[in-house]
């Protein structure tokens, strides 16, 4: 906390300009009027104040706006944003996408900080849903943003926003998140033709159910092994050897390299060895000929 001292003669700031970088912290506190600072916030970012000096400027704004800064000030915070705590940000009402972009720009190239996470949370809650423009902006700055949301939060993403999602935005999503996003993507891309549809839906397929995978197997999609390995195990298990062969097309040969890994390993255990042999890949571990497979889970469901 900077001591309250009188401003030295002739040092009272008439505007926010470069001369202020030569002021000591106590001089900034004594000589810069908070209301002047608020009206000329757009200048602060262009002036190379030290982080210690920025602390003083923040203190002045905090005194002027104890209930939280108005958006006209927030939009021009620039580097001063790095001095804000999540508690400060929770007092804000940020409604403009331009304000959000301006503040994300300051943090560009860094990990998502608690301040940024709080800012985004405030913004999205204020809007009521993650619309396409917001999602576009957030994923441009933080490709992993979507996967940082809980399934509950993802449920507020309208299908129209899915168009903004790039494959790399889903890299860190887990199956629970893809379970929520996949039906939205299916709805968003439903009017596209086969090959175009597959290109768009591919990165969401970790949330696809068996029936959709069966349908895709009839469309000559040639799914790559990386995509296949991300499918839900419970969705892959009921697929027949013929369906997997059609689904993967020329990539089916890749199953051999993945035979010890899920979901391939578990799928092999469910197939008849005879059927696996038709692939000519030397896959082992299927059900031997002459064995009868009883699906106990099905039996329990019936009783």
């Amino acid at each position: 906390e900077v001591e309250k001292t009188a401003c030295p003669s002739g040092k009272k700031a008439r505007e926010i300009d470069e001369s202020l970088i030569f002021y000591k912290k106590w001089e900034l506190e004594a000589c810069v009027d908070a209301a002047l600072l608020a009206t000329q916030m757009d200048r602060v970012n262009a002036i190379p104040f030290t982080y210690e000096q920025l602390d003083v400027l923040k203190h002045k704004l905090d005194e002027l706006y104890p209930q939280g800064y108005p958006e006209s000030v927030i939009q021009h915070l620039g580097y001063l944003f790095l001095k804000m705590s999540p508690e400060d940000i929770r007092k804000w009402n940020v409604t403009s996408l331009e304000t959000l972009k301006a503040l994300l720009e300051v943090n560009k190239g860094h990990e998502m900080s608690p301040q940024v996470a709080t800012l985004i949370d405030r913004f999205v809650k204020g809007r009521g849903q993650l619309d396409k423009d917001t999602l576009d902006t957030l994923t441009a700055f933080y490709p992993g943003y979507l996967c940082s949301l809980s399934p509950e939060e993802l449920s507020s993403v309208p299908p129209s926003s899915i168009w903004a999602v790039r494959p790399q935005d889903l890299d860190t999503c887990d199956p629970r998140q893809l379970d929520v996003l996949y039906p939205k993507a299916r709805l968003a891309f439903q009017n596209m033709n086969g090959s175009e549809y597959f290109v768009k839906i591919q990165s969401f397929l970790g949330g696809a159910p068996t029936e959709d995978l069966k349908a895709l197997s009839q469309q000559n999609v040639s799914m790559d092994l990386a995509t296949f390995m991300k499918l839900r195990t419970d969705a892959v298990l009921p697929l027949t050897v013929a369906e997997v062969q059609k689904l993967l097309g020329p990539h089916v040969e890749g199953l051999k390299a993945e035979e010890r890994h899920r979901p391939v390993r578990d799928w092999i255990l469910r197939q008849r060895q005879d059927d696996l042999d038709t692939l000519g890949l030397g896959l082992q571990g299927g059900i031997p000929n002459g064995y009868l497979v009883l699906d106990l889970s099905m039996q329990e469901a019936l009783s």
Partner: nanobody, 115 residues
């Protein structure tokens, strides 16, 4: 990695002259605005002088007319010529790129002026 190495500090009598040097590496020196900061014992950090990439200079009121900042782009070095030294100029002097916003931090070079 940005590196700034200050030198030229030492002891001087009031009224004497010292020249500080700061040699930079790891960034585009001729595109950068540079500054000299100082911190006296028990006092807070203070910006002494700046020089911008176009060569324009600025000074704190307390050193105007006594200190001169300059730079040699070929040597990636910024200088602070300090004349008519006063005891109140005693401090650790550090040079910084203004974009770093750091101020007084790191080693610096100690200047001690006795009356």
């Amino acid at each position: 990695e940005v590196q700034l190495v200050e030198s030229g500090g030492g002891s001087a009598q009031a009224g004497e002259t010292l020249r500080l040097s700061c040699t930079a590496s790891g960034f585009t020196f001729d595109d950068s605005d540079m500054g000299w900061y100082r911190q006296a014992p028990g006092d807070e950090c203070e910006l002494v002088s700046t020089i911008s990439s176009d060569g324009s200079t600025n000074y704190a009121d307390s050193v105007k007319g006594r200190f001169t900042i300059s730079q040699d782009n070929a040597k990636n070095t910024v200088y602070l010529q300090m004349t008519s030294l006063k005891p109140e100029d005693t401090a650790i002097y550090s040079c910084r790129t203004m974009a770093s916003r750091i101020g007084c931090w790191g080693q610096g070079t100690l200047v001690t002026v006795s009356s």
